[in-house]
């Protein structure tokens, strides 16, 4: 069974202040079962932009309907971007587990804010 | 609290056609996959078919092609049409919340489909 | 799709430990829950995404899995526990809901 792999199209986006970033994600497989999270940053201090399964995110939508049993269209849109936003973003799935395993990240997505057209 | 609200349950003959729904309250419908889920008297749970928020459906094996999903999220109502029912779709129909992961978290009381000549 | 098995009863003396096994089904492919269903009444969650337990479920119900047996375990059973427990498992494959036979829990 070929490998799961977690795919981030673009390298890096660019969104004046005030509007939204999309910021696409796709894995190859469902399998194993579990959840896919966004951080901004790596390592211990990174932080949690958007997780499937719980928590209340209300600047992050996703793109495709998270419900459909076959989705794996895992992209976000962030809504009124500001420059404190900017930093790269990573899309990472884990699989089940107590608690959850991280098991393949994307790679990365920078995202850098212009300044609001006057 | 979050409510579901099952109805239009009743006696009918084989070959006849039914419509269930099931009234949703206490939270986003909209934002739900949803489920039917069936017990045949002094029987086990059965998955009719799930539903998602944006109304792709799924059939367990021994309905597809009789049992229609739907759902109106301006209304708050799933929806199950029946056709051609047979005895062996006697039954309990209970509709589900499902949870992110297409399991089940709150139920409905269910309503009673009885198919009988 | 795949089969869940359950043993058809368990039976328990009150402030006992009761387990109820469920086996089938591929861990890395398969969510689990335990549904509690009472005689005449709607079933009711008390264990989801294999460990999970409702807020409003009482903590001496847990989950567990090992391999592809799941089990559910009541600490101090008490007599209101006494129930038939349904498995019910999510197959990320093939994208279909299964139950098991349902276990009968009786508090001797």
């Known amino acids: 069974e070929e490998e799961l792999q977690v795919i981030q199209p673009e390298k890096s986006v660019s969104v004046a202040a005030g509007e939204s970033a999309t910021l696409n994600c796709t894995a190859t497989s469902l399998i194993p079962v579990g959840p896919i999270q966004w951080f901004r940053g790596v390592g211990p201090g990174r932080e949690l932009i958007y997780h499937q399964k719980e928590g209340h995110f209300p600047r992050v939508t996703p793109v495709s309907d998270p419900t459909k049993r076959n989705n794996m269209d895992f992209s976000i849109r962030i809504s009124n971007i500001t420059p404190a936003d900017a930093g790269t973003y990573y899309c990472v799935k884990f699989r089940k587990g107590s608690p959850d395993v991280e098991l393949k990240s994307g790679a990365g997505t920078e995202l850098s804010v212009r300044a609001k057209p006057s | 609290d979050v409510q579901l609200v099952e109805s239009g349950g009743g006696v009918v003959r084989p070959g006849e056609s039914l419509r269930l729904s099931c009234e949703a309250s206490?939270?986003?419908?909209?934002?739900?996959?949803m489920s039917w889920v069936r017990q045949a008297p002094g029987k086990g749970l059965e998955w009719v078919a799930g539903?998602?928020?944006?109304?792709?459906?799924y059939y367990g094996d021994s309905v597809k092609g009789r049992l229609t999903i739907s759902r109106d999220n301006s209304k708050n109502i799933l929806y199950l049409q029946m056709n051609s029912l047979t005895a062996e779709d006697t039954a309990v129909y209970y509709c589900?919340?499902?949870?992110?992961?297409?399991?089940?978290?709150?139920w409905g009381l269910g309503t009673l489909v009885t198919v009988s000549s | 799709s795949y089969e869940l098995t359950q043993p058809p009863s368990v039976s328990v003396s009150p402030g006992q430990t009761a387990r109820i096994t469920c086996s089938g089904g591929?861990?890395?492919?398969?969510?689990y829950a335990w549904y509690q269903q009472k005689p005449g009444q709607a079933p009711v969650t008390v264990i989801h995404?294999?460990?999970k337990r409702p807020s409003d479920i009482p903590e001496r119900f847990s989950g567990s899995s090992s391999g592809t047996t799941v089990t559910l375990t009541i600490s101090g059973v008490q007599a209101e526990d006494e129930a038939d427990y349904y498995c019910?498992?999510?197959?990320?494959?093939?994208?279909?809901?299964?139950f098991g036979g349902g276990t009968k829990l009786t508090v001797l």
């Open positions: 206490g939270f986003t419908f909209s934002s739900n996959a």
């Open positions: 589900a919340r499902e949870t992110w992961n297409h399991l089940f978290d709150y």
């Open positions: 591929d861990y890395y492919s398969t969510y």
């Open positions: 019910g498992g999510y197959d990320g494959r093939t994208y279909i809901n299964t």
């Open positions: 539903i998602s928020s944006g109304s792709d459906t």
């Open positions: 995404s294999d460990d």
